[in-house]
């Protein structure tokens, strides 16, 4: 008996071939001997089976001695043994229909679990193997689970169902809902405008939800909500914003926030959360602001940074085109009695400059100028 595997919702062609290469009488029946379809001369005739409106054949192939049964929009319950009667012979084909579906939704939040469930006909004992877009293989029986979904799990999952040494392949598109970056750092000189961007790592036609940016300033004892907003069909509207700082928010995606001025009291880290409609859980992106200030008070030239800096960052003060006068893994450096000229304060990581602030030191009888 020939075995054919089909996919739920798909179309399958069961073949039946006669030795004579011409149109002759044929019938397809199910295991209960109920006629599905056949021919009467050149006409296609249908029986009283439950497949009636989903069964078809191809007249053009009958002249070649081929009498296919084509079943559209397959259902698990179409799994059966189908019998083709032609030339006083009977050809049997066992059709097994499988379905593979994602638990609740194919759009899942980062960190959530994906469960794939296999629907199979009674009496079958299939095995399933799935390959994620990043090449990770998982195996299972009726259900397969992947916990802690990551951004790289977004894309097409290819699952192979094996039964009777035959296989059928399913492709399921999974979208992991997340921000492109889990965390970002913005480095700014005091007084500069700050731009925070929160690009999403997915695109959907309609995006609705609400969000909030909580901020923990380095100098503050507790965190504070800086802004709350709504998202409706990719349009952003601000609900509430603090007076200090007075953030501005872009009206379109990607989510975009502007802080008019980088000030030491704002340096710190924030957490933007986005709750999407009909989703449990929230998307998170951490954002950090590091602010630099270079000042000269009397005979002391000082450079300071505020905000979350890594211990390996180097803060230096140097006269332009000269070697660094002072260079420390600290958040403040200074030079006493600095020479006149353009001084640079540099925050660097392994030689790469992250932030730079220039201050002009005038001869001692003048006051300093900050460009």
């Amino acid at each position: 008996k020939k075995v054919v595997l089909g996919k739920k919702g798909d179309t399958v062609e069961l073949t039946c071939t006669a030795s004579q290469k011409k149109s002759i009488q044929f019938h397809w029946k199910n295991s209960n001997q109920i006629k599905i379809l056949g021919n009467q001369g050149s006409f296609l005739t249908k029986g009283p089976s439950k497949l009636n409106d989903r069964a078809d054949s191809r007249r053009s192939l009958w002249d070649q001695g081929n009498f296919p049964l084509i079943i559209k929009n397959l259902k698990i319950e179409d799994s059966d043994t189908y019998i083709c009667e032609v030339e006083d012979q009977k050809e049997e084909v066992q059709l097994l229909v499988f379905g593979l579906t994602a638990n609740s939704d194919t759009h899942l939040l980062q960190g959530q679990s994906l469960t794939l469930t296999l629907e199979s006909p009674p009496g079958s004992s299939p095995s399933v193997q799935c390959r994620s877009p990043r090449g990770k293989n998982i195996q299972g029986g009726k259900t397969l689970s992947v916990s802690q979904l990551e951004l790289q799990d977004s894309g097409t999952w290819t699952c192979t169902v094996l039964q009777n040494q035959k296989k059928v392949e399913f492709k399921i598109d999974i979208v992991v809902l997340a921000f492109q970056k889990a965390s970002s750092i913005v480095y700014k000189k005091e007084g500069e405008q700050v731009e925070f961007s929160f690009p999403l790592a997915f695109t959907v036609e309609k995006l609705t939800g609400s969000g909030e940016l909580w901020w923990q300033a380095e100098r503050a004892s507790s965190s504070k909500s800086w802004i709350t907003f709504d998202l409706k069909n990719k349009e952003v509207s601000v609900k509430r914003v603090t007076q200090d700082p007075k953030l501005q928010m872009g009206k379109k995606l990607p989510l975009h926030l502007t802080l008019p001025q980088a000030l030491p009291q704002y340096a710190g880290s924030g957490n933007l959360t986005l709750a999407l409609e009909a989703k449990t859980g929230k998307l998170h992106q951490e954002v950090n602001l590091v602010v630099m200030r270079a000042t000269q008070l009397q005979k002391n030239l000082t450079c300071e940074v505020w905000g979350p800096t890594s211990p390996k960052l180097m803060l230096s003060l140097k006269l332009e085109n000269k070697e660094a006068k002072v260079s420390k893994r600290e958040k403040a450096v200074w030079v006493l009695n600095p020479e006149a000229g353009m001084w640079q304060c540099l925050l660097s990581d392994s030689g790469q400059v992250l932030l730079e602030s220039n201050i002009k030191v005038l001869p001692t009888w003048s006051t300093p100028v900050q460009p």
């Epitope: 798909d10 179309t11 062609e13 050149s42 078809d56 007249r59 053009s60 084509i70 079943i71 559209k72």
Partner: antibody, heavy 115, light 107 residues
Framework: QVQLQQWGAGLLKPSETLSLTCAVY????????WSWIRQPPGKGLEWIGE???????NYNPSLKSRVTISVDTSENQFSLTLISVTAADTAVYYC?????????WGQGTLVTVSS | DIQMTQSPSSVSASVGDRVTITCRAS??????LAWYQQKPGKAPKLLIF???SLQSGVPSRFSGSGSGTDFTLTISSLQPDDFATYYC?????????FGQGTNLGIK
């Protein structure tokens, strides 16, 4: 909803080879037959040939010696190759799904053969 | 090959008219016939299959009849959207063949 998206070179010189590909999105690939049909400017429709997911083909005898239709089931795509083209092969080429009837159709690709 | 002949080759009519297009096969094709509508610059669209079955989404003013060698497409009350070229096609045997088309224009 099944959609057919087709692409390929639109301008050829006589004796060159025409190559078109059609991708099937959003529906079953197996169980159906996948056809190519052409329509010369201002004229009627001509069936070129068909293929199914397992690679079984049928061709129009008038073109059989020059035509090859192939299938790539992993990508849900099928392709048309027509060798030794002449000006008479200038037409809009359509990819189409069928069992017995042609539906749906691709958007069509105008192929012009000119020296 | 089975030849499909449509008549008339072109016809002019007004909105609200009843229009009939015929298609004749050079040999018996039972009911293995379809009708298509094509508008300029667009792909054809399936209207009727198996001689008389209306394709899903097609307005009920379109109907098909016939069997064997003679077939008819009828538009009961012509609408502005119906001005187009109509083709019949046989699916009885290879190679599949189409009629030469009937151009339905505005009177």
């Amino acid at each position: 909803q099944v959609q057919l998206q087709q692409w390929g070179a639109g301008l050829l010189k006589p004796s060159e080879t025409l190559s078109l590909t059609c991708a099937v999105y959003g529906g079953s690939f197996s169980g159906y037959y996948w056809s190519w049909i052409r329509q010369p400017p201002g004229k009627g429709l001509e069936w070129i040939g068909e293929i199914n997911h397992s690679g079984s083909t049928n061709y129009n005898p008038s073109l059989k010696s020059r035509v090859t239709i192939s299938v790539d089931t992993s990508e849900n795509q099928f392709s048309l190759t027509l060798i030794s083209v002449t000006a008479a092969d200038t037409a809009v080429y359509y990819c189409v799904r069928l069992i017995n009837w042609f539906d749906p159709w691709g958007q069509g690709t105008l192929v012009t053969v000119s020296s | 090959d089975i030849q499909m002949t449509q008549s008339p080759s072109s016809v002019s009519a007004s909105v609200g008219d009843r229009v009939t297009i015929t298609c004749r096969a050079s040999q018996d094709i039972s009911n293995w016939l379809a009708w298509y509508q094509q508008k300029p610059g667009k792909a054809p669209k399936l209207l009727i299959f198996a001689a008389s079955s209306l394709q899903s989404g097609v307005p009920s003013r379109f109907s098909g009849s016939g069997s064997g060698t003679d077939f008819t497409l009828t538009i009961s009350s012509l609408q502005p959207d119906d001005f187009a070229t109509y083709y019949c096609q046989q699916a009885n045997s290879f190679p599949y063949t189409f009629g030469q088309g009937t151009n339905l224009g505005i009177k």
